[in-house]
């Protein structure tokens, strides 16, 4: 049993059938030494009388809020949470696996660049009863500080016949240089209450492998004379870091027809304009990703060939 | 239709072109080494990320870019000095900071040289010749070596007495591999920024 | 004293369904997951199915992907094997088990998918 | 499909220590617990060992588990007749958990 904060408390169990359980020991944050008795939750019936009260911790039914009363009169409250261990392996249940990049994904999270600065965001299909706590650092024998803000939901969706929601967080490195080059991860905790249920999930990344650069901005057109050919031009998003000449971004150019079926075209450019041929119809997109180290591409930036 | 990147015209800041090639080059041999050592902890998330540099040069913070000079985080030990006779050095007006950065970058290259030359004459011992340092990444790295000519004391290679343990030096290199990709990335954005300078 | 009781097995024709059941007892069924694990005559023993305790999440072998459903009724404390399209190949005998640490089996049912 | 591998059989003579190893690799055996069952003929498997090293109450202390690395193994240390059967090592991937992992297994015969 360990103490998450003031006055509520985990119990890890080994969660499986007719399982021993833990035994727990509360003790009434009191001066009183006598006429001291125990309830569970909204319940009146009396679990037992005295300073201390000794339970064996098995199921949910065991966890929840316990008080002790003297005369009527609160005391102190303790509330037991629990965090299951199924075969070794701590339970996901709160969580959605988002699978992407990979199996187990519970976290993901991105940067826009080098500045120290992400967000982090995970999916679970629970609405209500439901608290998040985000703690955040740079490694984790020595650790440096990042400072992250509350968890919000940040939108929901309908999957099939569940609602889907989504939560996220935006954490900052106190000190961070854009140009360092990491060596120590940043890692992510996440402390999820689902009414009496505990689960912790992490996430470890540098954020030069998280960066995903916003889409490029102003994207333009210019007529070439005499010919189907269109100058495209673009710039670097205003949250890319700079200086621009050092923290270069390289792109990719596409051509797409109305229909998904259609030949894409693609040209790849490390300047901010290129010469594409504009079919009728067509669209052009561009998305940007860092020159030299491949994290993620940019979301497309599109203007039609019109 | 993928069109290549134009490749930069030789009028260009001399370097840029080598450091370009040198970052393709460890970026190749890092997914090589990845996929030959699929059964070896070889990933980023499973290596300690030693940098063999560290308290030697101070490549980070010599190359820093003038517009960071004003981040305090940014600014932590800048004063290890280098010789400054450098031919990357386009014009008399480079300042000391210019010639202390290449000449840092120097450094790092001949450290990796050395480490690299090392691990591939065990692993040429390695009776599954699983893996072996490709040639290219090595020549890469004497071509920017000689680009940015400095003289520097020639390091002599290390020779071990033992019998090589196969298994610590493949993982060995795969720690060396994934710092040396980090630093020729941080080299190939100050050629890009110096080219624009 | 935990106990899971299996029935439904038989001989059923290729391409044919048949429908597994493991009554529980003895424990609070709905707090815990299950699985299905089955053994071919002479083999080794190969998992099959797997079911979260509220039944939100199930994850699938391979081999039966598509084409075998687990599902659970908790109000019933009873897990159910929904098998169609079977196979010469899904011949064995099937045990449901729960999950975690210490594990229950059951007693185990014969399914035989012949012509 | 069984990446859990075992010797196909092991032999000993009553009183002798007989060990199974389980090979793995990283994603499963590396990250993750085994088990170990014994299955007689005809019958559901039995739990010997569960989180690599611990007996449920019940198995014999003849039975210890282990696990290093990417490896597990089971020893019988005075190996008995009713001990001759089939056991089974069992883990998960990290990719694939809750799915269980079964090794390929391994007939424990006792001569004599």
């Known amino acids: 049993i360990w103490e998450l904060k003031k006055d509520v408390y985990v119990v890890e169990l080994d969660w499986y059938p007719d399982a021993p359980g833990e035994m727990v020991v509360l003790t009434c944050d009191t001066p009183e030494e006598d006429g001291i008795t125990w309830t569970l939750d909204q319940s009146s019936e009396v679990l037992g009388s005295g300073k201390t009260l000794t339970i064996q911790v098995k199921e949910f039914g065991d966890a929840g809020q316990y008080t002790c009363h003297k005369g009527g009169e609160v005391l102190s409250h303790s509330l037991l949470l629990l965090h299951k261990k199924e075969d070794g392996i701590w339970s996901t249940d709160i969580l959605k696996d988002q699978k992407e990049p990979k199996n187990k994904t519970f976290l993901r999270c991105e940067a826009k660049n080098y500045s120290g600065r992400f967000t982090c965001w995970w999916l679970t299909t629970i609405s209500t009863d439901l608290t998040f706590s985000v703690k955040s650092s740079r490694g984790s024998s020595d650790p440096q500080g990042v400072t992250c803000g509350a968890a919000t939901l940040s939108a929901e969706r309908v999957r099939g016949d569940n609602k889907e929601y989504e939560y996220s967080v935006e954490c900052q490195e106190d000190s961070a240089c854009p140009a360092a080059e990491e060596s120590l991860p940043i890692e992510v905790m996440v402390d999820a209450v689902h009414k009496l249920k505990y689960e912790n999930y992490t996430s470890s990344f540098f954020i030069r492998d998280i960066i995903k650069p916003d889409p490029p901005k102003n994207l333009q057109l210019k007529p070439l004379k005499n010919s189907r050919q269109v100058e495209v031009s673009w710039e670097y998003p205003d949250t890319w870091s700079t200086p621009h000449s050092y923290f270069s971004l390289t792109f990719c150019v596409q051509v797409q027809g109305k229909s998904k079926r259609e030949k894409k075209d693609r040209v790849f450019t490390d300047k901010t304009s290129a010469t594409v041929i504009c079919r009728k119809n067509a669209s052009i997109s561009v998305r940007a990703q860092d020159r030299y180290y491949s994290s993620s591409w940019s979301e497309w930036a599109s203007v039609p060939c019109s | 239709r993928n069109l290549p990147v134009a490749t930069p015209d030789p009028g260009m800041f001399p370097c840029l072109h080598h450091s370009q090639n040198l970052l393709r080059a460890v970026s190749n041999m890092l997914q090589k080494a990845r996929q030959t050592l699929e059964f070896y902890p070889c990933t980023s998330e499973e290596i300690d990320h030693e940098d063999i540099t560290k308290d030697k040069t101070s490549t980070v913070e010599a190359c820093l870019p003038l517009e960071l000079t004003k981040n305090e985080s940014c600014l932590n030990s800048r004063e290890t000095s280098f010789i400054t006779n450098g031919s990357c050095l386009a014009s008399r007006k480079t300042s000391f900071m210019m010639a202390l950065c290449l000449s840092s970058i120097y450094e790092d290259l001949k450290m990796y040289q050395v480490e690299f030359k090392t691990m591939n004459a065990k692993l040429l011992m390695d009776p599954k010749r699983q893996i072996f340092l490709d040639q290219n990444m090595l020549a890469v790295i004497d071509e920017l070596m000689q680009a940015l000519n400095f003289n520097s004391e020639t390091v002599p290679q290390k020779s071990s007495l033992e019998e090589p343990d196969f298994y610590k030096t493949k993982i060995k290199l795969c720690i060396l591999l994934h710092a040396f990709r980090i630093r020729a990335v941080t080299i190939d954005r100050v050629m890009s920024y110096l080219n624009a300078s | 004293q935990v106990q899971l009781v299996q029935s439904g097995g038989g001989v059923v024709q290729p391409g044919r369904s048949l429908r597994l059941s493991c009554a529980a007892s003895?424990?609070?069924?709905?707090?815990?997951?299950m699985h299905w694990v089955r053994q071919a005559p002479g083999k080794g023993l190969e998992w099959v199915a797997f079911?979260?305790?509220?039944?939100?999440?199930?994850y699938y072998a391979d081999s039966v992907k598509g084409r075998f459903t687990i599902s659970r009724d908790n109000s019933k404390n009873t897990l159910y094997l929904q098998m169609k399209s079977l196979r010469a190949e899904d011949t064995a005998v099937y045990y449901c088990?729960?999950?975690?640490?210490?594990?229950?089996w059951g007693q185990g049912t014969m399914v035989t998918v012949s012509s | 499909s069984y990446v859990l591998t075992q010797p196909p059989s092991v032999s000993g003579t009553p009183g002798q220590r007989v060990t199974i190893s389980c090979s793995g690799g990283r994603s499963n055996i590396g990250s993750n617990t085994v088990k170990w069952y014994q299955q007689l003929p005809g019958t559901a498997p039995k739990l010997l060992i569960y989180l690599n090293d611990q007996r449920p109450s019940g198995v014999p202390d003849r039975f210890s588990g282990s696990k290093s690395g990417t490896s597990a193994s089971l020893a019988i240390t005075g190996v008995q007749a009713e001990d001759e059967a089939d056991y089974y090592c069992q883990s998960y991937d990290r990719g694939t958990h809750p799915a269980l992992l079964f090794g390929t297994g391994t007939k424990v015969t006792v001569l004599g």
């Open positions: 088990k729960t999950h975690g640490s210490h594990d229950n």
């Open positions: 079911i979260r305790y509220d039944g939100s999440n199930k």
């Open positions: 003895g424990f609070t069924f709905s707090s815990y997951g």
